[in-house]
Interface confidence: medium
């Protein structure tokens, strides 16, 4: 038994049989191929409050601090995935590492990544039903980066 | 004919046939899934240079501005990755958005992106021979940010 | 075994400030990505989200209450606090405090039973 | 601001009907949450990830939708699912939980 991807899964179910509906082997294997954050998540270097550290990972010691949540979804792939989060509204000082600077913004990096969640094949039903791959774009934040605010025209 | 994921290629080959080694179409269907750069690429807009705008896409409105460059593999998937390249060693000035400060370094993000790679099967010859994906790790640069440097204990 | 369970005044007066404090057990608010939010809904109405905490202390706030509002928490003593200053008859609500999943990317996995504030001159 | 649009707002149906409560959100969201809860009580986590039913939720209940329109679907109504259903997302930037005016669900 091996993973089959669909684009559209609905229409053109390639599938995979699975037993009374629990994941395969191959399902389990792949999916678990969780994308882990850029930065190593640290304990001793999390982001506390709005403030720029001179040590540690790379989204605490940024002006604009970030810290990573975790979304886990055990039907898809990946199953984890990790959002950032921004720590201030504003960029913080590079002189001082804790006062904001009203000049700039930080804000979140989003981009749409592909990901492939499990569905039941369409029309399939029972205790040997199958399930089949659907590509969907997910939109996540990446990481959080100190802007020039827009000037509107 | 469907697109089989296999863990470990080489030693459990989970393949399908192609014609003539073209790749078969769900494969062109599937890997053409490329990954667009988070921000679109303006031609407008492309930061190009060390500064930072007040208008425009956030690479190029960033104090750390950068560039996104194309990374094209047609037996990858995605076959299209983008690398954001630092266009300055140090933060723009968010006052004049030209100078830059040495208080601050201009450093990419980097990602150990999941991706997988179209292989010919273990043992597998001749015209008809059979294919695979194998899975990998592949080291993107995701963006840059405007960092404190770091301080040696 | 997680609870949460929340404490106020009950009745207040108008222009007062409103202090509730949400207890609870069966988890640790210094965990990675552990958050509590307070939520409220008036009588016979929906639900409204107000604030939400973080283990790393980050704050936010809905913006239509953020000049009035403010989180905190005691992370040694399990406990989460919300403060609403110049309360009037719009702020008559039951308030819930509610924990989102380390890994249940924006939902609220346990809710505490409900505090019921009526403010009355 | 994201909102979110519940159908109807108070429905009924008779026992083993099946029935179907839609969520539509004015931007578009990576996932729906929803959420029952009947009088004086508080919510309960009842569909989270679109699709996945939280614990102790009968294998009747289904969530489903992507984008802008979502819906939660009851297979065969029995009396015990009579309540107020809630859907509700979440933005990162700006930073909002958002919750739908909620669908009243009563037996017929």
């Known amino acids: 038994v091996s993973l089959r991807i669909q684009e559209g899964c609905s229409h053109l179910p390639s599938c995979c049989p699975s037993k009374e509906q629990e994941p395969p082997e191959e399902w389990l294997k792949w999916s678990s191929a969780s994308v882990s954050p850029p930065e190593p998540l640290s304990h001793t270097h999390h982001a506390e409050s709005c403030r720029a550290s001179k040590d540690g990972p790379l989204n605490s010691r940024a002006i604009s601090p970030w810290s990573y949540e975790l979304d886990r979804d055990l039907n898809r792939v990946p199953q984890d995935l990790y959002h950032a989060r921004c720590l201030c509204p504003h960029c913080v000082s590079l002189q001082t590492g804790s006062h904001m600077d009203p000049l700039g913004n930080s804000v979140p990096l989003y981009h749409n990544q592909t990901v492939f969640y499990r569905r039941p094949c369409h029309g399939e039903e029972g205790t040997h039903r199958r399930y089949c791959l659907e590509r969907r774009l997910y939109r996540v934040s990446l990481a959080c980066v100190c802007v020039r605010p827009r000037v509107m025209a | 004919v469907s697109l089989r994921i296999q863990e470990g290629c080489s030693h459990l080959p989970s393949c399908c046939p192609s014609k003539e080694q073209e790749p078969p179409e769900e494969w062109l269907k599937w890997s053409s899934a490329s990954v667009s750069p988070p921000e679109p690429l303006s031609h407008t807009h492309h930061a190009e240079s060390c500064r930072a705008s007040k208008d425009g896409p956030l690479n190029s409105r960033a104090i750390s501005p950068w560039s996104y460059e194309l990374d094209r593999d047609l037996n990858r998937v995605p076959q299209d990755l983008y690398h954001a390249r630092c266009l300055c060693p140090h933060c723009v000035s968010l006052q004049t958005g030209s100078h830059m400060d040495p208080l601050g370094n201009s450093v990419p993000l980097y990602h150990n992106q999941t991706v997988f790679y179209r292989r010919p099967c273990h043992g597998e010859e001749g015209t008809h021979r059979r294919y695979c994906l194998e899975r990998r790790l592949y080291r993107v640069s995701l963006a840059c940010v405007c960092v404190r440097p770091r301080v040696m204990a | 075994q997680v609870t949460l369970k929340e404490s106020g005044p009950g009745i207040l007066q108008p222009s007062q400030t409103l202090s509730l404090t949400c207890s609870f057990s069966?988890?640790?608010?210094?965990?990675?990505?552990?958050?509590v939010s307070w939520i409220r809904q008036p009588s016979g109405k929906g639900l409204e989200w107000l604030a939400h905490?973080?283990?790393?202390?980050?704050?936010f706030y809905n913006p239509s209450l953020k000049s009035r509002v403010t989180i905190s928490k005691d992370t040694s003593r399990n406990q989460v606090f919300l403060r609403i200053t110049s309360v009037d008859t719009a702020d008559i609500a039951t308030y819930y405090c509610?924990?989102?999943?380390?890994?249940?990317?924006?939902?609220?996995?346990?809710w505490g039973q409900g505090t019921l504030v009526t403010v009355s001159s | 601001e994201n909102v979110l649009i519940q159908s109807p707002a108070i429905m009924s149906a008779s026992l083993g009907e099946k029935v179907t409560m839609s969520c539509r959100a004015s931007?578009?969201?990576?996932?729906m949450y929803w959420y029952q809860q009947k009088s004086d009580a508080p919510p309960k986590l009842w569909i989270y990830?679109?699709?996945n039913l939280a614990p102790g939720v009968p294998g009747r209940f289904s969530g489903s939708g992507s984008g802008n329109s979502y819906s939660l679907t009851i297979s065969s109504m029995e009396g015990e699912d009579a309540a107020t259903y809630y859907c509700?997302?979440?933005?990162?930037?700006?930073?909002?939980?958002?919750f739908g005016g909620g669908t009243k669900l009563e037996i017929k």
């Open positions: 509610a924990r989102r999943g380390y890994d249940n990317y924006g939902g609220f996995v346990d």
């Open positions: 069966g988890f640790s608010l210094s965990t990675s990505g552990m958050g």
């Open positions: 931007s578009s969201v990576n996932y």
């Open positions: 905490i973080y283990w790393d202390d980050a704050k």
């Open positions: 990830y679109t699709s």
């Open positions: 509700q997302q979440f933005t990162s930037y700006p930073y909002m939980y958002t």
